[in-house]
């Protein structure tokens, strides 16, 4: 059930073979007769014309597609979890801070799980890009810490209280995704209510050495323009009907009823097409586009 | 596993350093290693911590900025400098580890040791 | 500055009964808060974490819970062994006041 892209929304192809069929027939101007009846309902709505669905078509992340290609063509791989989310990283403005081969890279996330739901796995996913002379066989090792950044009161108000979530060590010999696990601070969101959370990734060399042009470097792909951009997945699972879920789900995928994102409910969670497709289809793969600012 | 060490008897207005020493791991990225006291008899109090990475960012509770100094003296070891040091320091130090800057959820302690300060 | 207020100071019960805490901060902690068990001349030991998350090893009888401001820890078919002070701790925010509540001394009889 492979994903194509999204040219044409369902209603406007839907209108265009209205036409087509009416047209066809003799002796009456159907065109001018649907353009009235449109006119006329649009009116009782309280429209002017027929609402573009452009803000809905946004690109969903190249491993967002992976992940609905993988489980709609082996089954097998689909986690336990019924919902998957994406979050993008919604700082586009501030620029990674290096110095003694320590560089930082700050995100922002916006992050929002019904509290109804479990959540069953969550990763940070980060594009590595490894750059480095093609004339050494070595690849690239560092150090990468994810920090959640906190608040500081009082006298420490300059500070920033910053909590460890995950470290690791990257052998890198190409640019690739990594994927870190923050299952707990995910819930740990969810459950305090919060929404917007600021996170800071580190890399450093492994040996604690400044870092020189034979060593290569190793970076962060932060840039809002790619597929690149750094992505939070949370799989989580909605116990409110989880058989009659299920039933559905697999149903839609052995049958490939759902070849476009849009009645996935990819487009966005909290806008309105996306939501009523996945309240009416139960879905099992949301993304997230929007930004929920709140504290 | 932690340990402590260079506690004893001072002087008030003296000075003294405390030394933690990890065996069987060596400090690196990922965690920070912190200061907390316990006078006889009271409860926990925060000091500082510091930054187990290349950065070797340090963090201090606001009474004892100035005062207390952490620093990473080797890939094993960290120190506190405590300086000016009245009865109300009194208190057993403890080593401890943890992935919060702010000292918060220490799941590695050392035993402690004891300073005195008394003339 | 954010002040944690830890109640009872103490608390006696006997074997096999149940034991509640509980710590008040007086701002919203987000559930960054973690409890520590403390026995005579030992050092202080992790049981939870983020509120309701057992530390490795803890036994399941130890429970936390709460958000916002409120928080608790429970104890449940107590044993001579869950003598202890127990101490609560924010981590949300680099904090000039303490960090760490006063502490609740509970007593198995």
């Known amino acids: 059930s492979p994903i194509m892209n999204l040219e044409q929304s369902p209603l406007e192809e839907d209108m265009s073979l209205f036409g087509d069929v009416f047209s066809e027939q003799d002796g009456v101007d159907f065109n001018t007769l649907l353009q009235s009846m449109k006119d006329e309902f649009l009116k009782t709505l309280n429209l002017s014309d027929i609402p573009t669905q452009d803000s809905a078509k946004v690109d969903p992340p190249e491993y967002m597609l992976e992940l609905y290609n993988k489980f709609a063509t082996d089954r097998t791989s689909m986690p336990s979890a019924n919902i998957i989310r994406s979050f993008k990283n919604e700082d586009l403005f501030s620029q990674p801070v290096s110095f003694n081969g320590l560089r930082k890279y700050p995100l922002l996330f916006n992050v929002s799980i019904p509290h109804h739901e479990e959540v069953i796995m969550a990763e940070l996913r980060l594009y590595t890009l490894v750059q480095r002379d093609r004339m050494i066989y070595d690849g690239v090792d560092r150090k990468i810490t994810i920090f959640e950044v906190l608040e500081s009161k009082g006298d420490n108000e300059g500070e920033r209280n910053m909590l460890v979530l995950v470290s690791g060590e990257i052998y890198g010999t190409n640019s690739e995704w990594e994927t870190f696990d923050v299952t707990d601070a995910i819930r740990r969101w969810q459950k305090s209510g919060s929404s917007t959370h600021q996170l800071e990734v580190h890399i450093e060399s492994k040996h604690d050495e400044a870092e020189d042009a034979s060593s290569g470097r190793l970076e962060i792909d932060t840039s809002a323009q790619n597929k690149h951009n750094p992505l939070l997945i949370v799989f989580s699972d909605d116990q409110s009907s989880d058989k009659e879920r299920k039933e559905e789900l697999n149903e839609m995928i052995s049958h490939e009823q759902l070849p476009e994102l849009d009645n996935l409910g990819l487009d966005s969670f909290s806008s309105g097409p996306g939501e009523e497709a996945l309240l009416q289809m139960r879905s099992n793969i949301i993304y997230d586009s929007t930004a929920r600012i709140r504290r | 596993s932690l340990e402590e060490s260079g506690g004893g008897l001072v002087q008030p207005e003296g000075s003294l350093t405390l030394t933690c020493i990890a065996s069987a791991f060596s400090f690196s990225s990922g965690y920070y290693m912190c200061w907390v006291r316990q006078a006889p008899g009271k409860g926990l109090e925060w000091i500082a911590c510091i930054y187990a990475g290349s950065s070797g960012t340090t963090y201090y509770a606001s009474w004892a900025k100035g005062r207390f100094t952490i620093s990473k003296a080797s890939s094993t070891t960290v120190t506190l400098l405590m300086t000016s040091l009245t009865a109300a320091d009194t208190a057993t130090y403890f080593c401890?580890?943890?992935?919060?800057?702010?000292?918060?959820?220490?799941?590695?302690w050392g035993p402690g040791t004891l300073v005195t300060v008394s003339s | 500055d954010v002040v944690m207020t830890q109640t009872p100071a103490s608390v006696s019960e006997p074997v096999g009964g149940t034991v509640t805490i509980k710590c008040q901060a007086s701002?919203?902690?987000?559930?960054?808060l973690a409890w520590y068990q403390q026995k005579p001349g030992q050092p202080p030991k992790l049981l939870i974490y983020d509120a309701s998350d057992l530390a490795s090893g803890v036994p399941s009888r130890l429970s936390g819970s709460g958000s916002g401001t409120e928080y608790t820890l429970s104890i449940s078919d107590l044993e001579c062994a869950d003598a202890a002070t127990y101490y609560c701790?924010?981590?949300?925010?680099?904090?000039?006041?303490?960090?760490f509540g006063g502490g609740t001394e509970v007593v198995v009889k």
């Open positions: 701790q924010q981590g949300y925010y680099i904090s000039g006041g303490d960090s």
């Open positions: 401890a580890r943890g992935p919060g800057a702010s000292g918060y959820r220490l799941g590695l």
């Open positions: 701002e919203d902690i987000y559930r960054l």
